[in-house]
């Protein structure tokens, strides 16, 4: 029949909820073509009638929902004025339980997504809903282990959770849901998506160990000049930033005005396997207003601090 | 509509001050970090300060370090940048931008021109 | 500070080709770069973040690639509102720093 043959790779599917592949394979779709599917090579086109749980709808295929018995493969043929193009995408659909429904878990899942974040940066996940525009998606609601997902470090923008600061702990099972309308009926539709985390850190490029400050306090006298190091070891090829820090805020800016507590200049010396850097704080005079506060010291994604205590009073 | 809203641009003199204000809607704005871009008279971009969205941290590249001041009410939906000893290099335009993750700018307001000469 | 090195500075196109610029940056970045369009007297726009995700809005024919140091950004089928500014912002680490932009013109 003069068609050329494309094979695509395989689609892994969820029983029980919608799901939808667009027949494009650019540049061919991009001119005047004509779209028609077809099941496991039936001479007979799949429906374009929008009643029909499995239907066209332009360059779609459409299942609503997808169902155990819709595995198989199927062939979209493009036409175009000079050309004929037939791509063969193998669908396989099973059961799938991403928390046991018995005890009033999610229901089935699709597809099994990977996805990674990456420790340190505000980073998001995306929930792939791929569907024609006569599907109207709803607002999208994101669960990690079964639980919704809230809090601060949150957002739900669109189609992606934006994570803020991404943690060790955010790694894990995710999915996100969303309702999805046709024709007046409501479906659910809920993708699994895996997550891990990158152990490439996120404003630097390694996860750096600060050898000191190690969350202490200090105890100093009152009008006397102190200089503290912050001691860190990082990979030779890291590119993280140290400095300190006072209420969130780079200690030289923070005390821009008086410049009695500065951060002193960075200074490393080269090991084989590492580099250890120095960056020291001077407090030119203890004043009573920096007792208490703790003085964080930032490298990359980590943190430690000291504090300034008065020394016990010596009843001797 | 995210609309962000930048003011305080002008003409000042080498060593003066400028304070930038970028007023923000159409968005929860607390909950995105957010970022000081300018562009030079030459087209260049250059990356100027970052806040995150709770206040707790600011970056900044070393040619502006200890002159800017990135800061930010929530309350009023507002990003603020204080420039202090202003160079004629720091002429250009400055845009304020939502910052959905990392270095990802989605929205930027229509900018305001600080020109710095004698 | 990483460097980031766009090319071509300029780049000659007709309507319908498909173009390339690359970012190169002077060590690993991972995936964080994003990709903007900036039309004359206009700010810049969002087209890619992490290197191959398409922002929301943006037509198909524009895709990104790459992680570590090098990264290609392609325009195929291109249209007469794609002759424009293109830059690439690295994101990794602090300071961030653009690339120097590439200016698309009709060939």
């Known amino acids: 029949d003069g068609c050329k043959d494309i094979f695509m790779k395989n689609e892994i599917l969820s029983a029980s909820q919608p799901f939808a592949f667009n027949c494009t394979f650019p540049p061919i779709t991009s001119g005047e073509v004509s779209v028609t599917w077809y099941k496991n090579s039936s001479k007979i086109p799949v429906s374009k009638i929008i009643q029909s749980r499995i239907h066209q709808d332009e360059t779609w295929i459409l299942f609503l929902p997808m169902e155990w018995g819709d595995s198989g493969v199927y062939q979209c043929v493009i036409k175009g004025r000079d050309s004929c193009h037939r791509i063969h995408v193998n669908l396989t659909v099973f059961e799938k339980h991403w928390c046991d429904t018995s005890i009033g878990g999610l229901p089935n899942l699709s597809d099994e997504y990977k996805q990674i974040l990456h420790l340190g940066k505000d980073d998001s996940l995306t929930c792939h809903l791929h569907f024609p525009k006569s599907c109207v998606l709803g607002p999208i609601k994101w669960y990690k282990d079964c639980n919704e997902i809230k809090g601060e470090r949150f957002t739900v923008l669109e189609t992606r959770l934006l994570v803020s600061n991404v943690s060790a702990e955010d790694r894990g099972n995710y999915a996100c849901q969303a309702i999805l309308t046709h024709s007046g009926k409501q479906y659910e539709v809920l993708n699994g998506i895996t997550v891990s985390i990158t152990e490439r850190a996120g404003y630097g490029g390694s996860v750096p160990k600060i050898i000191y400050p190690k969350n202490h306090s200090i105890e100093v006298q009152l009008g006397t000049t102190l200089i503290v190091d912050c001691n860190v070891t990082d990979t030779k090829d890291n590119t993280n930033l140290r400095c300190w820090r006072v209420n969130n805020t780079l200690v030289d800016d923070y005390y821009d005005e008086s410049k009695r507590i500065r951060e002193g200049v960075e200074t490393h010396v080269s090991f084989r396997e590492h580099n250890l850097y120095t960056v020291n704080i001077t407090f030119l005079e203890v004043k009573m207003e920096d007792y208490g506060l703790p003085f964080m010291c930032h490298a990359g994604v980590s943190t430690a601090y000291i504090i300034l205590q008065l020394p016990a009073p010596d009843f001797r | 509509e995210v609309m962000l809203v930048e003011s305080g641009g002008g003409l000042v003199k080498p060593g003066g001050s400028l304070k930038l204000s970028c007023a923000a809607s159409g968005i929860t704005f607390s909950r995105f970090a957010m970022s000081w871009i300018r562009q030079t008279p030459e087209k260049r971009l250059e990356w100027v300060a970052t806040?995150?969205?709770?206040?707790?941290?600011?970056y900044y590249p070393d040619s502006v370090k200890g002159r800017f001041t990135i800061s930010r009410d929530n309350a009023n939906n507002t990003l603020y940048l204080q420039m202090r000893s202003l160079r004629s290099e720091d002429t250009a335009m400055y845009y304020c931008?939502?910052?959905?993750?990392?270095?990802?700018?989605?929205?930027w307001g229509q900018g305001t021109l600080v020109t710095v000469s004698a | 500070e990483i460097k980031m090195t766009q090319s071509p500075s300029s780049l000659s196109a007709s309507l319908g080709d498909t173009i390339t610029i690359t970012c190169r940056a002077s060590q690993d970045i991972s995936v964080w770069l994003t990709w903007y369009q900036q039309k004359p007297g206009n700010i810049p726009k969002l087209l890619i973040y992490k290197a191959s995700n398409l922002h929301t809005g943006v037509p198909p024919r524009f895709s990104g690639s790459g992680s570590g140091t090098d990264f290609t950004f392609t325009i195929s089928s291109l249209q007469p509102e794609d002759i424009t500014t293109y830059y690439c912002?690295?994101?990794?680490?602090?300071?961030?720093?653009f690339g120097g932009g590439t200016k698309l013109e009709i060939k």
């Open positions: 912002l690295q994101s990794q680490s602090y300071p961030w720093t």
């Open positions: 931008a939502i910052m959905i993750t990392t270095g990802e700018h989605a929205y």
């Open positions: 806040i995150s969205s709770g206040d707790m941290y600011t």
